[in-house]
Amino acid sequence: MAVTACQGLGFVVSLIGIAGIIAATCMDQWSTQDLYNNPVTAVFNYQGLWRSCVRESSGFTECRGYFTLLGLPAMLQAVRALMIVGIVLGAIGLLVSIFALKCIRIGSMEDSAKANMTLTSGIMFIVSGLCAIAGVSVFANMLVTNFWMSTANMYTGMGGMVQTVQTRYTFGAALFVGWVAGGLTLIGGVMMCIACRGLAPEETNYKAVSYHASGHSVAYKPGGFKASTGFGSNTKNKKIYDGGARTEDEVQSYPSKHDYV
């Protein structure tokens, strides 16, 4: 029973995690304009992996897709790749794990096959989660580097009367969604791997016993006797002033209210 619960819980946790990774990848708020210690603007900028958006205080939002592929920073491309790999592995893992679930009967599938599938999906979830966490972390590191660079620029070259306010970007909601989702997928994968141990039939090796009969001796070699243990006992059960359908094309949304404090 514990194995089924662990496997089922692992599947559900991974499912939530992968849904989160997909959501994070699609979200526009990977980086958002830093409002702290800045003059209050009536325009709010935020950027995703696929497009950048500008929300005017009046309520209009305009988004523009990154139509270039070669012109994008290598780091952004790497983050995109990591997130997509994470989604693909996660999706395959989900597909495999559905058939591996102990509570689902598919033909005369043996427990050994289910165990192998559970382990495979578990590993896939772990790698998927790691890809998401890596992708989000790379992007976050990029933001931190750029933030301090633009902060340094803000306090240089301001001798003249006219000042230029540098737009600084900080962590957006998608980063936190990505980290949590990646962590959940990772945990789900670990749970699947633990469940696999309980599903796998154990091999019991009997030591060779020599019989000295009159005439010639016969040695019985250890055979491949398999004991089906059923539910393993070795498994463990472990949460300003105050600032739409989208296409890759430029989009303007219906007005909505935004505050800036």
Epitope: Q33, P39, V40, T41, A42, V43, N45, Q47, S52, C53, V54, E56, S57, S58, G59, F60, E62, R64, V162, Q163, T164, V165, T167, I240, Y241, Q252, Y254, P255, S256, K257, D259, Y260
Partner: antibody
Framework: QVQLQQSGTELVKPGASVKISCKAS????????MNWLKQRPGKGLEWIGQ????????NYNGGFRGKATLTADKSSRTAYMHLNSLTSEDSAVYFC???????????WGQGTSVTVSS | DIVMTQSPSSLTVTAREKVIMNCKSS????????????LSWYQQKPGQPPKLLIY???TRKSGVPDRFTGSGSGTGFTLTISSVQAEDLAVYYC?????????FGAGTKLELN
């Protein structure tokens, strides 16, 4: 079409208060910020503040905080500006204007003249 | 607060003449997110409310004659009237739409010779 109809001319005594109205029609009143502006005779325009009728949220120009109070009534699609402790400095034409694309005042009321005189 | 400086304060012109008026802001009104300048131009005729002509520094509001052209970026902006008509005689204001509080220039008065 979008229309903003403001209340008529006001003649008030110093120290008194006045409430100017701006009735909107022809658009989704709750979904656009309404701005209020002041124009003294022969002078430029000053932004007083803005209100979002959808939830009553407001932003004020620091120079008018305490002087002006902005409110809105969703049911009658009307925005109001209450001016208190009036002095001769408050004698001006007051405009309401809808906030549109590009953070611009795209439609304006005809203006309400307020004269403070004893 | 952002200071908007307009020049000249008044202009005396003749019909069909080309007119250029300037507006300078104390801080850049350029937003890198959408590559747009948050400056608008308004026209105000005597006894009337201001009327929006140009937004995003160079985008004409629908219904505005094409003789009105806005240009500039960052801190320096211009409004050009290619061929002045009698009905264009008014006061023209530039406005900062980027920073709170929203501020206006003192205006450029266009008069007929």
């Amino acid at each position: 079409q979008v229309q903003l109809q403001q209340s008529g001319t006001e003649l008030v005594k110093p120290g008194a208060s006045v409430k100017i109205s701006c009735k909107a029609s022809g658009y989704a009143f709750n979904s656009y910020w309404m701005n209020w502006l002041k124009q003294r005779p022969g002078k430029g325009l000053e932004w007083i503040g803005q209100i979002y009728p959808g939830d009553g949220d407001t932003n004020y120009n620091g120079g008018f905080r305490g002087k002006a109070t902005l409110t809105a009534d969703k049911s009658s699609r009307t925005a109001y500006m209450h001016l208190n402790s009036l002095t001769s400095e408050d004698s001006a034409v007051y405009f309401c204007a809808r906030w549109g694309t590009g953070n611009t005042m795209d439609y304006w009321g005809q203006g309400t003249s307020v004269t403070v005189s004893s | 607060d952002i200071v908007m400086t307009q020049s000249p304060s008044s202009l005396t012109v003749t019909a069909r003449e080309k007119v250029i008026m300037n507006c300078k802001s104390s801080q850049s009104l350029f937003n890198s997110g959408n590559q747009k300048n948050y400056l608008s131009w308004y026209q105000q005729k005597p006894g009337q409310p201001p009327k929006l002509l140009i937004y995003w520094a160079s985008t004409r509001k629908s219904g505005v004659p094409d003789r009105f052209t806005g240009s500039g970026s960052g801190t320096g902006f211009t409004l050009t009237i290619s061929s002045v008509q009698a009905e264009d005689l008014a006061v023209y204001y530039c406005q900062n739409n980027y920073f709170y509080p929203l501020t206006f220039g003192a205006g450029t008065k266009l008069e007929l010779n």
